[in-house]
Structures are given as C-alpha cells and as structure tokens.
C-alpha cells in the first residue's frame, strides 16, 4: 500500500475547476523531493503533466499549477477550464521519476446536465438577490400567480399573489408587477443561501390553460481566491461587496471549523492576535473596503471571509468574499526583532527592512493607532517632514542599497510605547510591524551631554561634550544636527586605528562638538550617538539655544574663517578645511502623490507634505563647521 494519500475519485463538470490535495509522509526527503501529477496511458506509462520542478505540459498551459506545502506535508494540483478530455486515470506522486511513491486518482468530467428546454437559468452568489421573470398570457392576468420550488415529490409554494409566503421566505420573497404590463410578473428573492438553489416553477392560472415556466436557480459560494504570502510580509484583502450593502458594517473573519471568527470590523471589534498589525479601510460608497495585515505569522494561514451586516458579524444570506491565505515560511523578508525595548529618557534605533531591489523607494515610519477602524499616520519619511510633536527626537536614516533604513527615536516616554510600521512606496509586502515597549529607567543613561542647559553666545566658541561608557569604546561616535528633514551627521576626523587600551577610565570617555564661531543657524537640536558601520545604536539629544552677546563678554576671532572645524586628538591639534554641501530644497509633490496604497495606511497623508531630503548624511543647510575632541587617557 502506498504511503501517499489523496482523493480516489474526483468528479466535476465541463468548465469547472478541481483542486486535488495529495498527502505525503512527514520526512525531510519527502518535503524537498520532486512532486508530480501524471496521466496513465493504456500502456501503463504515466506521462507527466505538471511537476514541482517547473515542468508544465502543453495541455495544461495557462490552466494548472502545482503547489507544495511542506509545513502541511501536502501538495495541491489546481486544474481549471476542465473539458471531457480531462476524464481519465492519474497519479499524484513523489520522486525523481514517475515510478516513485504515488497514489491513483480517477478524474471524471461530465457534460453540464441538460435541463428542460424552456428552463431559464439564474446564477447568483450567496447573499445576493435574484429577480425571476414570469411571463403569462393576457387571459391569465386576473388569475393567481405563484412561484413554487420543486422537491422530489411535489412543488412547494414559495409565494403567491394572495400574499401566501412559505415561512423560510418570509421577509425575503416579493411578488410584484411592473407598471401597466399585464403579461409578466416578477418574484424577487433576497439574501440567497445554498438552500435556495434548485428548480422552481412560475405559474399564472390553473389547469391546462395555466402559463408555466421552469427556472433553475444556482446559488454559488464564492470560490476562495488563493493568496500566497511570505512570512513577515503583509497581505491586503480587497473586499467588493456591492452597493446594496454600502451602508452596512463590514467585517473580516477567519474560518475556524464551524464558525467564522471576526478579526476586525468597522464597529471597533478587533482580535487581540492582530493588535498593532491590522487596518480596515472603507474605500468608497459602493461597499468596497480593504483590510491590511502586516507582520504575517505562520498561524495567520487559513480561510478568510469578508462580509457586511449591521451586526458586524457573519450572517447567512448576506454577501461574502473568501480567500485562502498560505504563508510561506521560506521568506525573503529578513527575521528582525518584532519587539524593541527602551527606557524613559533613552533611545531606540529601529532597523526597517525594505526590498533591496527598490533602494530608491520612499521610506516611511508610521504609528499604528487602534481607535476606530485603525490608521497609521506617518511620523517621518524620506520626503516627509517629522511630525511636530516629535521635534528634535525622531529621524530616519536611509542607507541606500543595503535593504535597511534606520529610524531613531530618543527622549523616550511611556507614551511612545505602541506599535509602529516600517513601509515604503514600493513593494507593499515589505511592511513590517514593530512593538515598542518603554520601561521606566532605573539607572543613568549610557550617553550624557554636558552642559545640560546649553546656551551658546553668538560669535563665540561653544563646546558640548558627550560622555560615553567603556562598552562603546570601539564604536564610532558622531554628532548630528537635527532638522525636520533628518539628522545631518557633522564631519569629524577619523582617528585611524586606535591603540588598544588595557584599562578604560569610565569617567573620561567623551566626544565633544565645538561651534566656532556660533551663528544664529546653529540654534536647534543636536544628537550625540554611536554606531558600528551602518548599524545605529544609542543616541541622546540636546537643544542648543543661541543668544546675542551681552556687553563685556569676550569675543573670539577665528584666525581662519575657512578652517572652522577642528579635531583635537590626544593633545595634537589637526586643522582641516571642511566645506559642507549646501542642501538644495527639492520641491516634490508629497510622499503620497503617486502611491494610492500608502494613502490607505494613514488618513493623515496630507499632513506629511515636505520638500528637501530627509535623514541623508550629506545634506545640510548651515555653513558652520564643527569640531570633535576625543580625549583618551
């Protein structure tokens, strides 16, 4: 007996499709070996039609696929547009040749069944309504009109013109005539269910002169759309239910055996498993809406259904749309920490992945807010100015080409705790969710700036020092000037290879920044931070105020206006002329101009218009230079 298992008999009709699942034993070899579907000929030979190696026969071109699900130990063969020629004996199997482990499957494709010649076929989806047209001769105009549903023995009344209604059609069936036309009556049945499918007879009059019409009502469950998504990526369920339910509450639920558990609805219900990673967005007045889920997990795979009903819950007889979501564990999206922890007063550096093939895409960072339907207003982006309430403490550093950009948030408070999304205007699958947890600080911060109340005097020299612990000794230290377009790293001299130090004096590790001479443009936020290559670490921020010199204060005349940045290294003074690029403001149409999907992420897109470059290390609008002192004892 074969260890492969599947359906022994599959029967369908022309034009339909089949989805054949074959089960294999749970071994590593089985999971990775070739899967195939072949047709058995009279000679006993089995001709491959499709295999997991990418082979697809001519007769299956454009209408079949084979998908392996190693996590379930199954593979599925989907075949569409069936014809009677597809009837036959097949094998689904594993192995490099078609003589490997296999299971016999018999497929029978029949003609669409013949109906009485005068039968009118109505095909409707579950939850929709149908209006059946019933013509009659003028002489039957005064007679009773009726619609009945055929059962094995009789024809059970649905509704008639004397206002008799079958209990299972109360509130759903209406018999009416239009205008002055006395040759046709109509029956409308709403909120269709599977049970309404079948043969009906319209009748006007009685006995041999009665007018009769056969009706075949087909009620279809929507075929689930198959969605294949990578672990940690995002998925959007686009739900289009039609104008008739435009004003009803909308929901997305996941099938759980007998029930469909609501994940989110427009009445504010949300499954805690999806906290921080789901949004529901009404699209228009035609009953269209979408649900976006980010940070996909293995357990998110399953059968989803969207619908509309005043209760915000699934109800039989209301329109639905369905999907089967598969989550591929062999993901292209790197495995990053989904929870980042910070302390009050401290900072976090969040590495956001993006598709490396889209290095020029615009990068954004938004904060997920669960109120209402959920939204994610953008806080910062490569062409979006930092939101006002984040002034001096939020910046985005784009590192073109390496598939990562970094968002730094400092001066943390417990209010900052929550969910944040990394996203771009490119590949929407690369949306990732980060939960930021902020605990009360229990010790001094790693980076400390002195003096803490920094007021610089116009025209004079001003120095601030950033103290760092020994554990940051080998890391690169930097100062940057913050603006709402990013934090521009100030130039410093690379000290070259440092001599290794056996002991490290905790009290004397510092990096200083000198403004010489202080100008009005120097006023603002400055950050001191550490990084290792392109990996950013902790930061601390200080606001430097600039005020006019009061009478009697000394004035330092710089000897050389072109050499204003100095680096003091172990008592050795090195002069260096540094000309800094001027930042040219680049007018742009705003971060969402050509990006419909991003607009759906946050309903505050219009607040994030900006010009200029954000977070780049080479754009700066001030012309004064800076000096870093590294003191080593």
């Amino acid at each position: 007996k074969s260890p492969i298992f599947g359906p022994q008999e599959v029967s369908s009709i022309e034009g339909d499709s089949v989805s054949i699942t074959c089960y294999y034993p749970d071994t590593s070899v089985n999971r990775h070996t070739r899967k195939y579907w072949c047709r058995q000929g009279a000679s006993g030979m089995c001709t491959t039609l499709i295999s997991s190696n990418g082979y697809l026969s001519k007769e299956y071109s454009g209408r079949a696929n084979l998908i392996n699900f190693p996590e379930n130990n199954t593979f599925v063969i989907n075949i569409e547009q069936l014809t009677q020629d597809d009837t036959g004996s097949y094998k689904c199997g594993l192995g490099t040749s078609n003589r490997g482990l296999s299971f016999d499957v018999s497929l029978e494709v029949s003609q669409v069944p013949e109906l009485p010649s005068d039968t009118h076929v109505y095909t409707k989806d579950i939850g929709r309504n149908v209006t059946i047209e019933c013509p009659f001769k003028r002489e039957n105009a005064p007679s009773k009109k009726s619609l009945c549903k055929k059962t094995n023995q009789s024809c059970e009344l649905v509704i008639d013109s004397t206002e008799k209604v079958n209990p299972s059609y109360i509130g759903r069936a209406k018999l009416f005539m239009k205008g002055t036309d006395l040759t046709v009556f109509y029956v409308n049945i709403s909120h269709l269910t599977h049970n309404d499918a079948g043969l009906y007879i319209c009748q006007a009059g009685e006995g041999p002169s009665a007018d009769k019409k056969n009706v075949d009502l087909q009620v279809l469950a929507p075929e689930p759309e198959l969605l294949y998504k990578d672990l940690r990526s995002s998925v959007t369920f686009e739900c289009d239910l039609g104008r008739e339910v435009a004003n009803e509450a909308k929901y997305l639920c996941r099938m759980n055996k007998e029930t469909c558990d609501v994940i989110i609805n427009t009445l504010g219900k949300r499954d805690p498993d999806f906290e921080g990673r789901i949004l529901i967005t009404p699209k228009d007045d035609n009953g269209r809406f979408s649900v976006l889920i980010t940070g996909l997990r293995k357990e998110d795979a399953g059968h989803y259904q969207c619908g509309a009903h005043s209760s915000g819950l699934p109800q039989e007889g209301w329109p639905i749309q369905t999907w089967q979501l598969f989550v591929n564990e062999e993901s292209t999206i790197p495995n990053r920490r989904s929870v980042v922890k910070g302390v009050t007063g401290g900072s976090v550096a969040i590495a956001c992945p993006y598709n490396p093939k889209e290095s020029s895409s615009l990068k954004y960072w938004c904060r997920w807010e669960g109120d209402g339907n959920g939204h994610c207003p953008v806080l910062v982006g490569t062409q979006a100015q930092v939101q006002e309430e984040y002034e001096g403490r939020l910046a985005l550093f784009d590192q073109p080409g390496n598939g990562t950009y970094t968002v730094i948030l400092n001066q943390l408070t417990t209010e900052d705790a929550g969910f944040y999304w990394c996203l771009t205007n490119g590949d929407s699958r690369w949306r990732t969710t980060i939960e930021l947890q902020v605990a009360e600080a229990t010790r001094e911060p790693n980076l400390e700036v002195t003096p803490q109340n920094a007021t610089a005097v116009l025209g004079e020299t001003f120095t601030v020092s950033c103290h760092y612990p020994c554990k940051f000794y080998s890391q690169e230290k930097y100062w940057c000037k913050w603006s709402n377009k990013g934090c521009h790293i100030l130039p410093s001299h690379d000290e070259g290879a440092r001599q290794s130090s056996v002991s490290c004096d905790q009290s004397s590790q510092l990096v200083s920044m000198t403004l010489n001479p202080v100008s009005k443009e120097d006023e603002g936020w400055y950050w001191c931070g550490v990084k290792q290559g392109q990996t950013y670490g902790e930061t601390t921020a200080i606001y430097i105020a600039v005020e006019e010199r009061t009478r009697g204060s000394s004035h330092v005349n710089p000897t050389d206006a072109n050499a204003r940045a100095k680096v003091a290294l172990e008592e050795e003074v090195v002069d260096s002329s540094i000309s800094e690029k001027e930042n040219k403001a680049i007018p742009n149409p705003g971060p969402f101009a050509n990006e419909r999907e991003i607009q759906n992420v946050g309903d505050q897109a219009q607040e994030n218009r900006a010009s200029g470059d954000a977070g780049s290390a080479d754009g700066q609008s001030r012309s004064s230079s800076s000096k870093h002192h590294h003191h080593h004892h």
């Epitope: 298992f5 359906p7 022994q8 008999e9 599959v10 029967s11 369908s12 009709i13 339909d16 499709s17 089949v18 989805s19 054949i20 089960y23 379930n72 269910t193 599977h194 049970n195 279809l220 469950a221 075929e223 099938m255 759980n256 055996k257 007998e258 059968h303 039989e316």
Partner: nanobody
Framework: QVQLVESGGGLVQAGDSLRLSCAAS????????MGWFRQPPGKEREFVAT??????????YYADSVKGRFTISRDNAKNTVYLQMNSLKPEDTAVYYC?????????????????WGQGTQVTVSS
C-alpha cells in the same frame, strides 16, 4: 449546529451488501465535508471514507482496506450521505459513525471533524 443520525446497520453474512445512511439536519448541508469512520471491537476509531464538494466538483476519499468494495455518495436534496458496502468481510464488523466538519486539513483524521452521530452497528458473520 448539525445533528447526524445514522441508519442501515445490521447483521449480515460475509459477501453480502449493506447501505448505511447519514441524515444531517441543521445548517447548510452543502458546506460540509462528510465522512464515515468505524470502530471495531476493542480497537481505535479508523477512517473509512469521506466525501467533500466544492461547487459542482466532488472529491471521494477511501481507506485502502475498503477500496473497490465501498462507495460513498450524497443526496443534497435529502441532506443525506450514504455508504454502500459490498462484499462485506468479518473484519468489517464495527460500529460505523458518520462525521461532519466545514474545514478538514486531513480527511483521514477523526479529530478534524466537529460533529458525530451516535453510530450504527454492522456485524458480518462468516
């Protein structure tokens, strides 16, 4: 909720035939995967056959031990599933259970099914 009622069991001779019926009441019948399982005396419950459908496509699964002898079928109008058992053997003696579920990952696994009937006894004497 779905109620399942089996009928058609009995005592037969080896080589004879029997037809079991499973009548379902409750929710929409056509949305279910319906299966037959059996429990021989002193043994675990085991898979016999399952029928599932999607639109106009029907899928039938059988255990190796009954292939070619048993046939599973359905009548949607009557909300009933049948198990036609031919060429019965003494080892087919068991209590036969009807089972139903809306979603089944593996049709052979009893724990995949949400609803069960009370069972009907089939005894095959030699």
């Amino acid at each position: 909720q779905v109620q399942l009622v089996e009928s058609g069991g009995g005592l037969v001779q080896a080589g004879d035939s029997l037809r079991l019926s499973c009548a379902a009441s409750g929710r929409t019948f056509t949305t279910y995967v319906m299966g037959w399982f059996r429990q021989p005396p002193g043994k675990e419950r085991e898979f016999v056959a399952t029928i599932s459908w999607s639109g106009s496509t029907t899928y039938k699964y059988y255990a190796d031990s009954v292939k070619g002898r048993f046939t599973i079928s359905r009548d949607n109008a009557k909300n009933t599933v049948y198990l036609q058992m031919n060429s019965l053997k003494p080892e087919d003696t068991a209590v036969y259970y009807c089972a139903a579920s809306t979603v089944v990952a593996d049709p052979r696994a009893p724990n995949e099914y949400d609803y069960w009937g009370q069972g009907t006894q089939v005894t095959v004497s030699s």
